[in-house]
């Protein structure tokens, strides 16, 4: 690496992946192993994030970018940059302090994460229920009863619940 020549700040020419080494007369030195600098002009390199335990490595650390973690199977990410991993539940359940609990009647969860939500109120939009809701599925709304042709049945039984359903994101 060549010594920087900037008169104002000799460190400003140090590219990402290096740091301005005060101990070596402000020469641009490469980041040591397990550290990175994502922008130029850094006076130190940041320590790479380590994906341990319930976290697993999604992207390895490089000299210019931090490692990225996601969660091991059975868990999903929470928080910015996957700062936490939370246990998955099955569809039709939500995670409580006491573990995974089935959704109450009138609510559903079609994912392995998140909360049980109330079935959609079709009448809010002047529609009727076309397909009944279940613990795993929301209702499907359809035309208002007035829009249906005479003799047509308005409600379809729910489709049978199947895994994997909505995949955790």
């Amino acid at each position: 690496f060549e010594r920087t020549r900037s008169l104002q700040d000799p460190c400003s020419n140090c590219p990402a992946g290096t740091f301005c080494d005060n101990n070596r007369n402000q020469i641009c030195s490469p980041c040591p192993p397990n550290s990175f600098s994502s922008a130029g002009g850094q006076r130190t390199c940041d320590i790479c994030r380590q994906c341990k335990g319930v976290f697993r490595t999604r992207k390895e650390c490089s000299s210019t970018s931090n490692a990225e973690c996601d969660c091991t199977p059975g868990f999903h990410c929470l928080g910015a940059g996957c700062s936490m991993c939370e246990q998955d539940c099955k569809q039709g359940q939500e995670l409580t302090k006491k573990g995974c609990k089935d959704c109450c009647f009138g609510t559903f969860n079609d994912q392995k994460r998140g909360i049980c939500r109330p079935w959609t109120n079709c009448s809010l939009d002047g529609k009727s229920v076309l397909v009944n809701g279940t613990k795993e599925r929301d209702v499907v709304c359809g035309p208002s009863p007035a829009d249906l042709s005479p003799g047509a049945s308005s409600v379809t039984p729910p489709a049978p619940a199947r895994e994997p359903g909505h995949s955790p994101q």
């Epitope: 959609t120 209702v139 499907v140 909505h166």
Partner: antibody
Framework: QVQLVQSGAEVKKPGASVKVSCKAS????????INWVRQAPGQGLEWAGN????????NYNQKFKDKATITADKSTSTAYMELSSLRSEDTAVYYC????????????WGQGTTVTVSS | DIQMTQSPSSLSASVGDRVTITCQAS??????LNWYQQKPDKTAKLLIY???RLRSGVPSRFSGSGSGTDFTFTISSLQPEDIATYFC?????????FGQGTKLEIK
């Protein structure tokens, strides 16, 4: 009537960010999912993610997880999608859509916002 | 992710023709299949939801059928205003995915 009105076209430089807005009217904003869909020039449709404005619960397509941030402002009935670290491949029309009554289909579409990324 | 394979990618037909588009899902999606019309001005419109349910205000010449992995969209008698690109979309499993589209032209 139910309407989604999106912000105007944007031209951005690579590396920049852009925040596209989608103002909803004619219905209870907090009771329906808002989806975001991308259409690159001459390409098909790609679902980026969605938000339930009542509690701001979001889902993302893994492909957009590091690219898009979806938010909603209940006070103005407006949903947003912010795109970061823009690259030329992000050049596309971005649509917001509202569900039909349950999340499984999209009944109302905004007019689309063209985002062009060019140096 | 669930792949949606739509065919044909384009087709040319005459006014009054019966037009059929198919969509195949890479896994069972029950009946959570929707069809959209996108006109050249880029506005998109939901025509059919939950495989076969016609949205209010949509002409009855449009219909849909199928279940599981194989789905069909039909225009019984093509009209000039039907010139558009048609997309299928599965709403069964996140992330929602679309077919690549069928561009319909008048002969």
């Amino acid at each position: 009537q139910v309407q989604l009105v999106q912000s105007g076209a944007e031209v951005k430089k690579p590396g920049a960010s852009v925040k596209v807005s989608c103002k909803a009217s004619g219905y209870t904003f907090t009771s329906y999912w808002i989806n975001w869909v991308r259409q690159a020039p001459g390409q098909g449709l790609e679902w980026a993610g969605n938000i339930y404005p009542s509690d701001s619960y979001t889902n993302y397509n893994q492909k957009f997880k590091d690219k898009a941030t979806i938010t909603a402002d209940k006070s103005t009935s407006t949903a947003y999608m912010e795109l970061s670290s823009l690259r030329s491949e992000d050049t596309a029309v971005y649509y917001c859509t509202r569900d039909y009554g349950s999340a499984y289909s999209m009944s109302t579409w905004g007019q689309g916002t063209t985002v062009t990324v060019s140096s | 992710d669930i792949q949606m394979t739509q065919s044909p990618s384009s087709l040319s037909a005459s006014v009054g023709d019966r037009v059929t588009i198919t969509c195949q899902a890479s896994q069972d999606i029950s009946n959570y299949l929707n069809w959209y019309q996108q006109k050249p001005d880029k506005t998109a419109k939901l025509l059919i939801y939950y495989t076969s349910r016609l949205r209010s205000g949509v002409p009855s010449r449009f219909s849909g059928s199928g279940s599981g992995t194989d789905f069909t969209f039909t225009i019984s008698s093509l009209q000039p205003e039907d010139i558009a690109t048609y997309f299928c979309q599965q709403g069964d499993t996140l992330p929602y995915t679309f077919g690549q589209g069928t561009k319909l032209e008048i002969k």
